[in-house]
């Protein structure tokens, strides 16, 4: 004979001696039918605020508040965000090994600088781990009029001042 | 809406250059990193490399050094990709790809989509 | 220099679950993304840092990524779902793909 409690829909629990469907009680929740309980909510309190709230077929979903940001699967831990120079692993902040850069604040990868010889324009300022390397105008011959500008937009996770 | 426009189908020679615009809209075109990808027929997905639209900074795929070139045209929102000494086997459907902003691992949000390049003598 | 190999084809039945794997060494020290790809068209993001969804995708995506595995999953598998899918990540400064995967749903 087929057991009751297999027709029991996610978000209700059921016990084999009183196979009867039965509602999550309030705070916990259940995304499989049938099981004999309801997991607990987890709530999101400290460093951790609430991305997705409990429902009785989903658990609650954390992410950490500003300023911080989550490590471990589910976001089980809050730690503070990576300054320019670093980029964010799973292991943590990292700095920029030589030679890469990140310009943004609490996210993004270290890059490697810019070649500038590779588009065959030689090097107006040399990189660090905050920022790219300035390459300058293309290595040609001039003519009296050429001039280099300089744009005040931001960039990709917000440049300043780059001369192009 | 964010659009990534690629130019049209073009064939070429071998040994003659390509160049592949890809004109951006519904967002703010310096903000976003601008990737180029490539698929060979009936083959899998191949980067070439990225432009920083903002300062002209690039980075490619070590295969493609020396033969391509990625620029830019702020005032159009234009990200360019030209491969030169073409061969057979850059026969392949080239892609632009924006790279998703405060995100890790440089995932690609927006994919244009894609302009044919057939290298045939 | 790493290299992410995909089985080069998955089936399933309608309704049911899929797994593609997507496999390096160590890659689960690294965030993987994945692709949806469609003949004809251009890819889609599905999954970015192992398993956020971008807005759009079904919740019926989902990933994980530890030790050298990085797994794409599709609950409730539909004919819709067929496609290629590529896995890809960020590694000593290139962006990698996998070859990847053909995802057939059974007739």
């Known amino acids: 004979v087929q057991n009751s409690c297999d027709n029991c829909q996610p978000g209700t629990f059921c016990r084999k001696y009183n196979p009867v469907c039965k509602s999550c009680p309030p705070s916990t929740f259940s995304s499989i039918g049938g099981q004999p309980n309801c997991n607990i909510c987890r709530v999101c309190a400290g460093y951790f605020r609430f991305k997705k709230f409990c429902s009785s077929t989903h658990n609650a979903e954390c992410e950490c508040i500003e300023g911080f940001h989550c490590l471990g699967p589910q976001c089980t831990r809050c730690e503070k965000d990576c300054r320019p120079g670093q980029e964010l692993t799973k292991q943590g902040c990292k700095t920029c090994s030589l030679g890469t850069f990140n310009d943004q604040n609490g996210t993004g990868v270290c890059r490697p600088w810019t070649n500038c010889s590779l588009d065959g324009r030689s090097v107006l300022k040399t990189g660090t781990t905050e920022k790219d390397v300035v390459c300058g105008p293309p290595v040609v011959s001039f003519s009296p009029s050429t001039t280099i500008s300089v744009t005040p937009e931001g960039g990709p996770g917000g440049h300043s001042l780059q001369v192009l | 809406q964010v659009q990534l426009v690629q130019s049209g189908a073009e064939v070429k020679k071998p040994g003659a250059s390509v160049k592949v615009s890809c004109k951006a809209s519904g967002y703010t075109f310096t903000g976003y990193y601008m990737h180029w990808v490539r698929q060979a027929p009936g083959q899998g997905l191949e980067w070439m490399g990225w432009?920083?639209?903002?300062?002209?900074?690039?980075n490619y795929a070590q295969k493609f050094q020396g033969r391509v070139t990625m620029t830019r045209d702020t005032s159009i929102s234009t990200a360019y990709m030209e491969l030169s000494r073409l061969r057979s086997d850059d026969t392949a459907v080239y892609y632009c790809?924006?790279?998703?902003?405060?995100?890790?691992?440089?995932?690609?949000?927006?994919w244009g989509q894609g302009t044919l390049v057939t290298v045939s003598s | 220099e790493l290299e992410l190999t995909q089985p080069p084809s998955v089936s399933v039945s309608p309704g049911q679950t899929a797994s593609i794997t997507c496999s390096a060494d160590k890659l689960g020290d690294k965030y993987a993304s994945w692709y949806q790809q469609k003949p004809g068209q251009s890819p889609v993001l599905v999954l970015y840092?192992?398993?956020k969804r971008p807005s759009g995708i079904p919740e019926r995506i989902s990933g994980s990524n530890s030790g050298n595995t990085a797994t794409l999953t599709i609950r409730g598998t539909q004919p819709m779902d067929e496609a290629d899918y590529y896995c890809?990540?960020?590694?000593?400064?290139?962006?990698?793909f996998g070859g990847g995967t053909r995802l057939t749903v059974l007739r």
């Open positions: 432009i920083n639209p903002q300062s002209g900074g690039t």
């Open positions: 890809q990540t960020w590694d000593t400064n290139t962006v990698l």
């Open positions: 840092e192992d398993s």
């Open positions: 790809a924006r790279e998703g902003g405060e995100w890790l691992a440089i995932p690609f949000d927006y």
